[in-house]
């Protein structure tokens, strides 16, 4: 049986997700992120809420957070651009673009991920991959190496049931099932990848993990294509 990675997943194949980023605060993993262009990482706006006095950096090319790896490199952040409509008390518009101090050195372990521009819902039941260095069990253990899990997309109507997220899931958000397998604390800002394309970003709300009645919530990147393009331009 799975030994509780991400929640209910497993250790990722090293460097098989070259788009994966660790957004770090004062040298410690804070949130996930995804390289969407040579000099830009997409993450979640809420991740930087408490980072006012700290040093924010982005780690690329990593599998282990602690061990030396030839592909690993820590980049300073030149500019942090949260979505203008993001707010501390809601999960809406929970996107953040981080401009690296320089273009990332690309290679087999560092490569941008194509992101979805067609604003159409992913079909319910589609298996999507979510990865991160977030907690891996209900004790709160944090892993050193990247973890991942495959999750089926959940239709919005089910996700919006009163027993689930009670109408909070707008058309700009999507859900994935959370029955024991789930993204969790520390995975926020990381990528939800369907068919090799970035479809969603893990939101950073205060959701209970691994409870099937509280599905994972992801910001649909296609719904924010215009904003992403305007910042990257």
């Amino acid at each position: 049986p799975p030994r509780g990675r991400i929640l209910g997943g497993r250790e990722a194949e090293a460097h098989a997700r070259p788009y994966m980023a660790s957004v770090q605060l004062n040298g410690a993993h804070l949130c996930g992120g995804v390289l969407v262009a040579e000099q830009w990482v997409l993450s979640a706006a809420h991740c930087l809420e408490d980072a006012a006095d700290g040093k924010v950096q982005v780690l690329l090319g990593a599998h282990s957070l602690s061990q030396p790896e030839p592909s690993k490199r820590l980049y300073d952040v030149l500019r942090a651009v949260p979505h203008p409509d993001s707010q501390p008390d809601t999960i809406d518009h929970d996107l953040l673009l981080l401009q690296l101090s320089e273009k990332a050195t690309l290679g087999p372990a560092v490569r941008p991920l194509p992101w979805q521009r067609v604003d159409r819902d992913v079909a319910p039941g589609t298996l999507c991959d979510v990865a991160g260095w977030g907690i891996v069990n209900h004790a709160g253990r944090r892993p050193d190496s990247l973890q991942h899990v495959l999750l089926p997309v959940l239709d919005r109507a089910t996700c919006n049931r009163r027993t689930h997220h009670d109408g909070a899931i707008t058309e700009r958000l999507m859900c994935a099932e959370s029955n024991r397998r789930d993204s969790c604390k520390g995975d926020s800002g990381g990528p939800l990848v369907c068919g090799g394309v970035l479809e969603g970003v893990v939101t950073s709300g205060s959701r209970v993990c691994g409870n099937r009645k509280k599905p994972g919530i992801y910001t649909r990147v296609a719904s924010y294509a215009a904003w992403i393009d305007s910042v990257l331009a």
Epitope: R3, G4, A28, I135, A139, K185
Partner: antibody
Framework: EVQLQQSGAELVKPGASVKLSCTAS????????MHWVMQRPEQGLEWIGK????????EFDPKFQGKATITADTSSNTAYLQLTSLTSEDTAVYYC??????WGQGTSVTVSS | QIVLTQSPAIMSASPGEKVTMTCSAG?????MYWYQQKPGSSPRVLIY???NLASGVPVRFSGSGSGTSYSLTISRMEAEDAATYYC?????????FGGGTKLEIK
């Protein structure tokens, strides 16, 4: 070095309440879960509950529901356990722990008239 | 809630001897933690997620198991291993402990 410093021993009367503290150093309590564990004299360990200090979400073993309250103050990097309506059955050592990997030294609570 | 039964409750072993203790779950769990506690001290985690050795724990300790049956093994008993050992499951809320196995040195 990660450390959890717990408050000192308590001698309290039956029916009273007590609030224990657990102050963390060298890590941010918001990054993981903080748990409280009870150990009665010469007995085993019992999980009381946990808190996610980032948002205040808590989870308790049902048998401690109504007896225990767990809170956290992220500005002081401290977790708290409050116990109410104390009886002799609550006489125990109470441990705080970060994600079950680092543990405080324990706080002894004695309930006696 | 899931009841964890540890056996034996008390055991003794000579230095250098192999020691195995078990933790039986009332229903299936996905993974197990093991802790060591010496008198007057706080518990310390030995094994997480069934078989992973915690930082700083000697390699003579190992964990294994699945479903309802889990075990902790000490490949060669040392005097400093005399302690009480607890299992705990992190699969199903509430997250229960076993009653403990007290290991003494012969």
């Amino acid at each position: 070095e990660v450390q959890l410093q717990q408050s000192g021993a308590e001698l309290v009367k039956p029916g009273a309440s007590v609030k224990l503290s657990c102050t963390a150093s060298d890590f941010n309590i918001k990054d993981t879960y903080m748990h409280w564990v009870m150990q009665r004299p010469e007995q085993g360990l019992e999980w009381i509950g946990k808190i996610d200090p980032a948002n205040g979400n808590t989870e308790f073993d049902p048998k401690f529901q109504g007896k225990a309250t767990i809170t956290a103050d992220t500005s002081s990097n401290t977790a708290y356990l409050q116990l109410t309506s104390l009886t002799s059955e609550d006489t125990a050592v109470y441990y705080c722990t970060r994600a079950m990997d680092y543990w405080g030294q324990g706080t002894s609570v004695t309930v006696s008239s | 809630q899931i009841v964890l039964t540890q056996s034996p409750a008390i055991m003794s072993a000579s230095p250098g001897e192999k020691v195995t203790m078990t933790c039986s779950a009332g229903s299936s769990v996905s993974y197990m933690y093991w802790y060591q506690q010496k008198p007057g001290s706080s518990p310390r985690v030995l094994i997480y997620d069934t078989s992973n050795l915690a930082s700083g724990v000697p390699v003579r300790f190992s964990g294994s198991g699945s479903g309802t049956s889990y075990s902790l093994t000490i490949s060669r008993m040392e005097a400093e291993d005399a302690a009480t050992y607890y299992c705990q499951q992190w699969s199903n809320y509430p997250y229960t402990f076993g009653g403990g196995t007290k290991l003494e040195i012969k």
